[in-house]
């Protein structure tokens, strides 16, 4: 039977080394055996490159394309092939479809004055455009109480958040995770970082009386 694309490719770039495209076929497909995504930078002399897709689900294909350090002017021509059959053709401008890398190494440390210091790493090297553009969202949730969660927006430069222990339930176990976005690039949110868990052992003030 003929091969058809149900949902055409949607692509995002981490704006440093990789762009990822995902699409859905109209029936279960062995993506790596049946399909190829070709990509070529719209720049004089550029070569055509081929990405071998992998299956994410039965009919969902994903292709990770290594790209050079992206700049705003870069535009790629994309062609999705099933053998000699062109299934889809389009263009992709990484600077207009940014999904930042996931923040790393989230840790929680006790700090002075009954506060917790949450720290993580900026996923971009200092020379990359996005290094100074990221803002973060931190989600803190009670492991035993789904209703007890807080969301903090970190809009200042440093990848840190100070959290008063008194804002959390004493003796409860909490988990935190962090994600990033780049406002000036109108990016989507990054994936969430892995969670880190700690015990909030703050004693309420009344217990001292």
């Amino acid at each position: 039977g003929s091969v058809k694309v149900l949902h055409e490719p949607s692509c995002f770039s981490d704006y440093i080394s990789t762009s990822v495209c995902q699409w859905k076929m109209d029936h279960p497909t062995n993506c790596s055996a049946e399909l190829r995504l070709s990509y070529q930078l719209d720049f004089m002399g550029s070569e055509n490159h081929t990405c071998v897709p992998e299956n994410r689900e039965d009919s969902v294909c994903v292709c990770s394309m290594p790209i050079d350090d992206a700049v705003e002017a870069d535009v790629y021509q994309l062609d999705l092939w099933a053998g000699q059959q062109l299934l889809w053709s389009g263009s992709f401008q990484p600077s207009k479809h940014v999904k930042p890398r996931t923040p790393g190494n989230l840790t929680v440390h006790p700090n002075i004055s009954h506060t917790w210091l949450l720290m993580w790493t900026n996923p971009y090297p200092t020379e990359n455009h996005l290094h100074s553009e990221l803002t973060y969202m931190v989600n803190v949730s009670n492991d035993n109480d789904p209703e007890d969660f807080k969301v903090y927006n970190v809009t200042y430069m440093g990848p840190t958040l100070r959290l008063a222990a008194s804002t959390l339930k004493s003796g409860a176990s909490y988990s935190a995770r962090v994600r990033a976005w780049a406002q000036t690039y109108n990016s989507t949110w990054s994936d969430w970082s892995p969670s880190t868990t700690w015990l909030n052992y703050y004693e309420p003030w009344e217990q001292h009386l």
């Epitope: 055509n48 050079d68 002017a73 870069d74």
Partner: antibody
Framework: EVQLVESGGDLVKPGGSLRLSCVAS????????MTWVRQAPGKGLQWVSL????????YYADAVKGRFTISRDNAKNTLYLQMNSLRAEDTAVYYC??????????????????WGQGTLVTVSS | DIVMTQTPLSLSVSPGETASISCRSS???????????LDWYLQKPGQSPQGLIY???KRASGVPDRFSGSGSGTDFTLRISRVEANDTGVYYC?????????FGQGTKLEIK
């Protein structure tokens, strides 16, 4: 040492054909785009054509489009320019030059960093 | 097509002085920050052209630091300080950003 040696230039009548060759050595030929530039007697430089490293993409000046064909044989480290339907205004010294490195996703550019000695094409009846 | 306009078309300079050649393009040659696609070439009498400057300001291998390029967007300048007799020839600017690649008309530098 990088070397580019052009050959094939000759006296040819209008409407005739000629094939220029440029043999390269001293660098990884397939990694680089190659360019032809010409210079009419007493005139300035005029770009003619470019081919990327794999040979998969070619570009031409309007003045030669449809008449000239650029190609390459990476196994022989040789660049070609097939010139058909030649006209008097094609009379020039033809230079081949090493252009951008096209092995990377975005071609890396270092200028036309090496030129051949040129070969003279004369179109006259 | 991108039109390249050089000024002056000829220049006469005494040894030891500084020579400046201007090149203006009809469209911006800045692809991104730090990437200005403008080259300078020198063709000495009876020789093939040789590269001097690429990407607006980067010196080609073996080119003395007396040669410097500057500019961005549509306005570029080649400066030759402490001019020597050996610098005689025709200087061309060229844009390698878009097909067709285009050259300026050339500037003939004469040493007095």
């Amino acid at each position: 040492e990088v070397q580019l040696v052009e050959s094939g230039g000759d006296l040819v009548k209008p409407g005739g054909s000629l094939r220029l060759s440029c043999v390269a050595s001293g660098f990884t030929f397939r990694d680089y785009a190659m360019t032809w530039v010409r210079q009419a007697p007493g005139k300035g430089l005029q770009w003619v054509s470019l081919i990327n490293g794999s040979g998969g993409k070619t570009y031409y000046a309007d003045a030669v489009k449809g008449r000239f064909t650029i190609s390459r044989d990476n196994a022989k480290n040789t660049l070609y320019l097939q010139m058909n339907s030649l006209r008097a205004e094609d009379t020039a010294v033809y230079y081949c030059a090493v252009d951008r490195k096209t092995k990377t996703i975005r071609p890396q550019y270092y200028g036309l960093w090496h030129w051949g000695q040129g070969t003279l094409v004369t179109v006259s009846s | 097509d991108i039109v390249m306009t050089q000024t002056p078309l000829s220049l006469s300079v005494s040894p030891g002085e500084t020579a400046s050649i201007s090149c203006r393009s009809s469209q911006s040659l800045t692809y991104s920050i730090g990437y200005n696609y403008l080259d300078w070439y020198l063709q000495k009498p009876g020789q093939s052209p040789q590269g001097l400057i690429y990407l607006g300001s980067k010196r080609a291998s073996g080119v003395p630091d007396r040669f410097s390029g500057s500019g961005s967007g549509t306005d570029f300048t080649l400066r030759i300080s402490r001019v020597e007799a050996n610098d005689t020839g025709v200087y061309y600017c060229m844009q390698p950003l878009q097909s067709p690649l285009t050259f300026g008309q050339g500037t003939k530098l004469e040493i007095k």
